[in-house]
């Protein structure tokens, strides 16, 4: 999906008002310095591409993020403010439902959500030069 046509300011508002809080809740009990940020993004469409991938694509050691509250709110925000997004994700969602077995918070998931927090922060500051 091409995120170029999304309403970025509305997605930013959704992140600041709800998604960020859900990410913090998920990460509660871990230190902010515990994980190094290894995933980065260069502009807002790129950030959303990476956020989408990390949030909804199962990875080795973490296959259970899609049903978390922050993930559901992310999906809704993308559907609401990215024209055509929801329909492109229907098949992916069905595949995800089949893949998901149980909701277990692993260290790998915590690391992945830490990466997500970094991507969202970068999305909110698009004019900052890449480090």
């Amino acid at each position: 999906y091409d995120f170029t046509n999304c309403d970025f300011e509305k997605i930013k508002a959704a992140y600041l008002s709800t998604i960020s809080k859900d990410l913090i809740t998920y990460m509660s009990g871990t230190k902010s310095t515990e994980f190094n940020n290894t995933v980065s993004c260069s502009n807002r469409p790129h950030c959303l591409t990476e956020i989408q991938s990390l949030t909804f694509n199962p990875t080795a050691g973490c296959a259970s993020l899609a049903k978390e509250m922050f993930a559901m709110k992310t999906k809704a925000a993308l559907a609401i403010w990215c024209p055509g997004y929801s329909e492109t994700q229907i098949n992916a969602t069905q595949a995800m439902k089949k893949a998901r077995k149980s909701k277990v918070t692993t260290n790998k998931c915590l690391e992945q959500v830490s990466q997500l927090q970094g991507l969202w922060r970068r999305f909110n500051r698009p004019l900052l030069k890449q480090q």
């Epitope: 559901m72 809704a76 997004y85």
Partner: antibody
Framework: EVQLVESGGGLVQPGGSLRLSCAAS????????MTWVRQAPGKGLEWVSS????????YYADSVKGRFTISRDNAKNSLSLQMNSLRAEDTAVYYC??????????????WGQGVLVTVSS | DIVMTQTPLSLSVTPGEPASISCRSS???????????LHWYLQKPGQSPQLLIY???YRASGVPDRFSGSGSDTDFTLKISRVEAEDVGVYYC?????????FGGGTKVEIK
């Protein structure tokens, strides 16, 4: 400029057929769900039908189900509403609108000028 | 079907004064993903409707900030902080939580 222009309205006898068209311009038509809304003379707004951007999902009001067919041609940036077995209660101004999919929560953010359909003998 | 009920039916307002329109749904419009699928439209005399507010409180592009939306669950309000002559027309609420999408009956706003 984002624009929706309807055509095809007119006077038709009960039981007759009519095909409404909507030409879209100024935006990437294939990215958006589209919806038909109607308004009977002096009355409020009534949702008629919606179609998602790739035609995967189509919805109809019970009052038109089995009689009306919504379709779109993304290559031509056009939306259509085929209306069969028309009744007097279908008399209304029909609006072509952008939205009705998930985008903006299904709100209708662009409206055409409307086209009048009169069903009378 | 979700029934949308608007009050009042009509409203006569002095320019510069505030106005408030209520919309009530027969069931909650809160989606499980955390957004509420309630929108407001204005139909000015002789014109097509236009989107004012979507998802309860988000102003549509180009809508003046004197318009604001609020509410949750089944009770919603559209407020105009200072009514201007150009605000006359019929205001409609709409739910898009589930099909059939349904509109309120409308509230006619006139200037005194």
């Amino acid at each position: 400029e984002v624009q929706l222009v309807e055509s095809g309205g007119g006077l038709v006898q009960p039981g007759g057929s009519l095909r409404l068209s909507c030409a879209a311009s100024g935006f990437t038509f294939s990215n958006y769900g589209m919806t038909w809304v109607r308004q009977a003379p002096g009355k409020g707004l009534e949702w008629v039908s919606s179609i998602t951007f790739a035609s995967s999902y189509i919805y109809y009001a019970d009052s038109v189900k089995g009689r009306f067919t919504i379709s779109r041609d993304n290559a031509k940036n056009s939306l259509s509403l085929q209306m069969n077995s028309l009744r007097a209660e279908d008399t209304a101004v029909y609006y072509c609108t952008r939205g009705g999919g998930a985008y903006y929560g299904g709100s209708l953010d662009v409206w055409g000028q409307g086209v009048l359909v009169t069903v009378s003998s | 079907d979700i029934v949308m009920t608007q009050t009042p039916l009509s409203l006569s307002v002095t320019p510069g004064e505030p106005a408030s329109i209520s919309c009530r749904s027969s069931q909650s419009l809160l989606h499980s993903y955390g957004y509420t699928y309630l929108h407001w439209y204005l139909q000015k005399p002789g014109q097509s409707p236009q989107l004012l507010i979507y998802l309860v409180s988000y102003r549509a592009s180009g809508v003046p900030d004197r318009f604001s939306g609020s509410g949750s669950d089944t009770d919603f309000t559209l407020k105009i902080s200072r009514v201007e002559a150009e605000d006359v027309g019929v205001y409609y609420c709409e739910q898009t939580l589930q099909t059939p999408y349904t509109f309120g009956g409308g509230t006619k706003v006139e200037i005194k």
